[in-house]
């Protein structure tokens, strides 16, 4: 039950996170005109990854896309790439995790396959979240660097325009949305990975019985082995003291090398 809850919660948190990453990527307010201690203008400038906008005091807003690809700064291109990679990985992760959900039955899919898929989606969410956080952080660093630079006739770093008036840019809402969304996706991914550890396959219908061969301390199991998932627990027989048969239900589990990805 706890595993299902952890998996479900991880999925929901990741879903919200990826929706946030998509929203942040599409938002125009990655950087906004700094209004503090600046010449007060009757227009408000703000910029996104794809276009820059100007809002006049009347409320009239005009946005212009960055129609050049080669003319854009490498850093902006890198941020775009990171955000898109984050979205793609997140979307694939969501698709995979839907099929991996314990509460959803698809044909005769084994728990081992679900565990595999849960881990895969978890890793995808983690990478997706890291991509978003990295993208937003790179952009924020770019803003901080430009903020302190002399801005008279300076290259704004956005859309290849020359700055003719001292306009400084500060963090826009999209940066905060991106950081939070990236963090949520990361947390969701971690939860999926944790859930994967608890997704042990269902027991076989018959009991595996241990037999003592005379003069040997080795227990022999005729069939009925658990299929190794690569993600679940390794099975190791308990030492048998009473010479009687023990069921696999009593077998202790030990962490495998796959548990710590």
């Amino acid at each position: 039950m706890a595993v299902t809850a952890c998996q479900g919660l991880g999925f929901v948190v990741s879903l919200i996170g990826i929706a946030g990453i998509i929203a942040a990527t599409c938002m125009d307010q990655w950087s906004t005109q700094d209004l503090y201690n600046n010449p007060v203008t009757a227009v408000f400038n703000y910029q996104g990854l794809w276009r820059s906008c100007v809002r006049e005091s009347s409320g009239f807003t005009e946005c212009r896309g960055y129609f050049t690809l080669l003319g854009l700064p490498a850093m902006l291109q890198a941020v775009r790439a990171l955000m898109i990679v984050g979205i793609v990985l997140g979307a694939i992760g969501l698709l995979v995790s839907i099929f991996a959900l314990k509460c959803i039955r698809i044909g005769s899919m084994e728990d081992s396959a679900k565990a595999n898929m849960t881990l895969t989606s978890g890793i995808m969410f983690i990478v997706s979240g890291l991509c978003a956080i990295a993208g937003v952080s790179v952009f924020a660093n770019m803003l901080v660097t430009n903020f302190w630079m002399s801005t008279a006739n300076m290259y704004t770093g956005m859309g290849g325009m020359v700055q003719t008036v001292q306009t400084r840019y500060t963090f826009g809402a999209a940066l905060f949305v991106g950081w939070v969304a990236g963090g949520l996706t990361l947390i969701g991914g971690v939860m999926m990975c944790i859930a994967c550890r608890g997704l042990a396959p269902e027991e076989t219908n018959y009991k595996a019985v241990s037999y003592h061969a005379s003069g040997h301390s080795v227990a022999y199991k005729p069939g009925g082995f658990k299929a190794s998932t690569g993600f679940g627990s390794n099975t190791k027989n308990k030492k048998i003291y009473d010479g009687g048969a023990r069921t696999e239900d009593e077998v202790q589990s030990y962490p495998s090398k796959h548990d710590y990805v």
């Epitope: 203008t41 227009v43 400038n45 910029q47 006049e56 009347s58 409320g59 009239f60 020359v162 008036v165």
Partner: antibody, heavy 120, light 113 residues
Framework: QVQLKQSGAELVRPGASVSLSCKTS????????IHWVKQRSGQGLEWIGR????????YYNENFEGKATLTADRSSSTAYMQLSSLKSDDSAVYFC?????????????WGQGTSVTVSS | DIVMTQSPSSLTVTTGEKVTLSCKSS????????????LTWYQQKSGQPPELLIY???TRESGVPDRFTGSGSGTDFTLTVSSVQAEDLAVYYC?????????FGGGTKLEIK
Amino acid sequence: QVQLKQSGAELVRPGASVSLSCKTSGYIFTSYWIHWVKQRSGQGLEWIGRFYPGTGTAYYNENFEGKATLTADRSSSTAYMQLSSLKSDDSAVYFCTREGYGKGNAMDYWGQGTSVTVSS
Amino acid sequence: DIVMTQSPSSLTVTTGEKVTLSCKSSQSLLNAGNQKNYLTWYQQKSGQPPELLIYWASTRESGVPDRFTGSGSGTDFTLTVSSVQAEDLAVYYCQNDYYFPFTFGGGTKLEIK
């Protein structure tokens, strides 16, 4: 059509206050900035400030801070400017104007002006 | 405050003549975000309130005759009247529409011979 009708001429004593009105019609009053401009006899134009009736936000030219107070009555779509502690150099024609939408903050409609004479 | 300087202060021309009015600002009125200049031209005829002629330095207000043309960028702007008519007798003001407080030039009085 858009119209801005200003109140009649005022003759006031030095040190007194006066309130000028600007009744608007033909557009949504709360969606546009109202500006006030001063023009002394035979001289140029001086921007006093602007007021947004939708939110009650006002911006003033520092030279008129404490001199002019901009307000509005949304129910009657009327903007007001109160001038206090009047002196002789406050004698001028005062215009109310509307800031256009998508016109680079330009003032596209003007009232006919109100003449204020400060004299003892 | 931004200082707007207009020249000449007055100008006498004959009808049909081409006339150029100049306006200079102490700071650039070009906004990098949309590459637009926030400069406006007004025409004020005697005893009347000013009328909007040109905004964004070069966009004609609807109803304004096409003989009026605005040009320039940054700090230097011009208003050109391609063929002056008798009804163009007025004072022309340029205005900074970018920085607060908005400021007007001293005006150029256009007179007809």
